[in-house]
Amino acid sequence: DSSKWVFEHPETLYAWEGACVWIPCTYRALDGDLESFILFHNPEYNKNTSKFDGTRLYESTKDGKVPSEQKRVQFLGDKNKNCTLSIHPVHLNDSGQLGLRMESKTEKWMERIHLNVSERPFPPHIQLPPEIQESQEVTLTCLLNFSCYGYPIQLQWLLEGVPMRQAAVTSTSLTIKSVFTRSELKFSPQWSHHGKIVTCQLQDADGKFLSNDTVQLNVKHTPKLEIKVTPSDAIVREGDSVTMTCEVSSSNPEYTTVSWLKDGTSLKKQNTFTLNLREVTKDQSGKYCCQVSNDVGPGRSEEVFLQVQYAPEPSTVQILHSPAVEGSQVEFLCMSLANPLPTNYTWYHNGKEMQGRTEEKVHIPKILPWHAGTYSCVAENILGTGQRGPGAELDVQYPPKKVTTVIQNPMPIREGDTVTLSCNYNSSNPSVTRYEWKPHGAWEEPSLGVLKIQNVGWDNTTIACAACNSWCSWASPVALNVQYAPRDVRVRKIKPLSEIHSGNSVSLQCDFSSSHPKEVQFFWEKNGRLLGKESQLNFDSISPEDAGSYSCWVNNSIGQTASKAWTLEVLYAPRRLRVSMSPGDQVMEGKSATLTCESDANPPVSHYTWFDWNNQSLPYHSQKLRLEPVKVQHSGAYWCQGTNSVGKGRSPLSTLTVYYSPETIGRR
């Protein structure tokens, strides 16, 4: 059943004398493996013998391979899938039909393949895109229906016979579908490539020429133009004539329209290849070009810069920047239309020529107030001198100058006075709009630049003012020199450093923090009595009687100030102790007797000790000793001792007499 044999291979293979042919081939014999293979050249079926006749190029049997002449033909296949063949070298007389006679156990098949061998290497074929436009990348393809592993070839691209520098990509195909060698070249043609010959050259491995194909490039492009001008330098004076001519050096396809442009704008009614300009004016200066269009698009010539020369026009001055701040830099620019450009400038400040200033720009690195005013200039070129324009105004701004703070009051100023100050200045640009005062205070400003300080403080030492426009200028501080009575008067103990004990040497100092004027007098007083007129009050040996409230006074020509009352405390051991008895020193037995220890002490007595007539201490530590019920045996002399942090003091003896009650007497 012949339907069981399936073959795939190229229908026809191409080669040339001395080259080789590689035949990619696959098959499928579904009933079993291949047992016999014969390669025929132009096979013909013989009905008598039921066999094929023809030249046997290759034969393979179960017994083994039959060698072919010089091993020219090789079967590179296998028994079930591959039927690839190679003929190397191939000859002209190999052209025709190759027959592959396949036999398996039960089936036979004859597969035919066409072989076309030419005498000389056949040319490749160049493929071009349908249209080529300048600067648009295209791919040129060179195709050769040949490829063989045993015969390497190369394809080279030439432009007008010179190898092209662009890199080509060569690919080969040796598959059951196709056999070819292809070279692809990416290329961006320019208009100058139009009409040029491109060649694809087939070469062997050594670069020897085998064959080629050529094509002529048809590169579509916009018209390429040349512009010519009379006079050739395109420099004229007002009133002269100018002629410009437009020439087309190349156009594909043919051009259709012509126009002229000045500074990119189309000139009306100028549609010929010649542009005539009669009696030109300076306004006709500019860049001219011609534009010619075809189906691809418009082409433009290079620009011709027509210069119509004229004397400078009236100048204007540009100032960078006005208003200018004093100390900043300023640049003046003289602007005057002229052709050629001005070569010399004359500058004026307030109508007076500025010596040595001949440049287009004037630079003043450090502006001062006197630089203010009107600046103008005159420009000059080879055709004449321009007129002086209206000029520009430079405004120089600066902080207020020579600011001073002035005291309006008669001197001296006393604490509590109302002080008026004014803030004066010499000049200012812009005008002074406000004033500032240092230090800040809740002060009145009755009018601009005037400060009124009600009830001036003793510590208002200096005042400074600032006059302000966009900036503030501060005056040097002015001293108010306020006079005041002595301040912060206080009594300070100089010695002793610790607490004062009776008998100590004591010194008190009358201190004050400040006084203006500085000349002062001192007064000491205790309970309204004057004690001394020195800054110190001294006690050689202090006694408890010196304790009390002390004040000192300090006065100057403005007034006098008293200290706070200062308490002088003298510490002393208990003294003047005595025992008092209640209800009296004679008490009836059975009643209550209270003994009190009276004393004078600073600090007060912390505890007492009570003693009887035998100096035996009683277990009491309080000021009062209560005997209840009192007995006759309690009669006797008692004394007490008082103790504080300074020391001890004792009382003299006090006698308590306890007498019998009437009941006791009655019982006896």
Epitope: S606, H607, D612, W613, N614, Q616, S617, L618, P619, Y620, H621, S622, K624, R626, L627, P629, K631, Q633, H634, G636
Partner: antibody, heavy 119, light 107 residues
Framework: QVQLQQSGPGLVEPSQTLSLTCAIS??????????WNWIRQSPSRGLEWLGR?????????DYAGSVKSRITINPDTSKNQFSLQLNSVTPEDTAVYYC?????????WGQGTMVTVSG | DIVMTQSPSSLSASVGDRVTITCRAS??????LNWYQQKPGKAPKLLIY???NLETGVPSRFSGSGSGTDFTFTITSLQPEDFATYYC?????????FGGGTKVEIK
């Protein structure tokens, strides 16, 4: 070593007299550097000083104001002891009664006697 | 009479804690203040006399300070045997008076 030994009834009828004795060993009731105290303790009143006796050149007594009209503390030099007498007792006098020596603080105490006033 | 006010009336503490008790007199008593410890069913025991003097045989962890009207009693590191009630007492004048006591309990 100084010791104080208390003696006396634990139950006293209301309006009767409470009598307790404190016997001293290791010290003298007539010592002139100490005082001999009676203190009682009850849940309602806490520690309450009642009075003291002490000898200097003669005998002295001090009593708390709350019991001044009912109390007597006597020294007995012959027996080296001191006693407490509290007249006209009421149930409020129910407490633990202590005797104590005072020499820079009460440094020696009796064992305490629980006295209940109940009819 | 001089009134002695003790605070707090009770406190809970752990072994090793520092415990402080204060006592205030209604008038100045100089340094005539004593501190006592009392355990249930026992008589009070003198610890400190005259505000800061340690009674013979009393451990040094007990201390006292103050004079005038304000006094402090401190146990620096509480021991298991220290859980008891503590009293202050003035010996400045008669009647002798005691504070209300501070009960130190185990936390």
């Amino acid at each position: 070593q100084v010791q104080l030994q208390q003696s006396g009834p634990g139950l006293v009828e209301p309006s009767q007299t409470l009598s307790l004795t404190c016997a001293i060993s290791g010290d003298s009731v007539s010592s002139d550097s100490v005082a001999w105290n009676w203190i009682r303790q009850s849940p309602s009143r806490g520690l309450e000083w009642l009075g003291r006796t002490y000898y200097r050149s003669t005998w002295y007594n001090d009593y708390a104001g709350s019991v001044k009209s009912r109390i007597t503390i006597n020294p007995d030099t012959s027996k080296n002891q001191f006693s407490l007498q509290l007249n006209s007792v009421t149930p409020e006098d129910t407490a633990v009664y202590y005797c104590a020596r005072d020499r820079n603080g009460m440094d020696v105490w009796g064992q305490g006697t629980m006295v209940t006033v109940s009819g | 009479d001089i009134v002695m006010t003790q605070s707090p009336s009770s406190l809970s503490a752990s072994v090793g804690d520092r415990v402080t008790i204060t006592c205030r007199a209604s008038q100045s008593i100089s340094s005539y203040l004593n501190w006592y410890q009392q355990k249930p069913g026992k008589a009070p025991k003198l610890l400190i006399y005259d505000a800061s003097n340690l009674e013979t045989g009393v451990p040094s962890r007990f201390s006292g300070s103050g004079s005038g009207t304000d006094f402090t009693f401190t146990i620096t590191s509480l021991q298991p045997e220290d859980f008891a009630t503590y009293y202050c007492q003035q010996s400045y004048t008669t009647p002798l008076t005691f504070g209300g006591g501070t009960k130190v309990e185990i936390k």
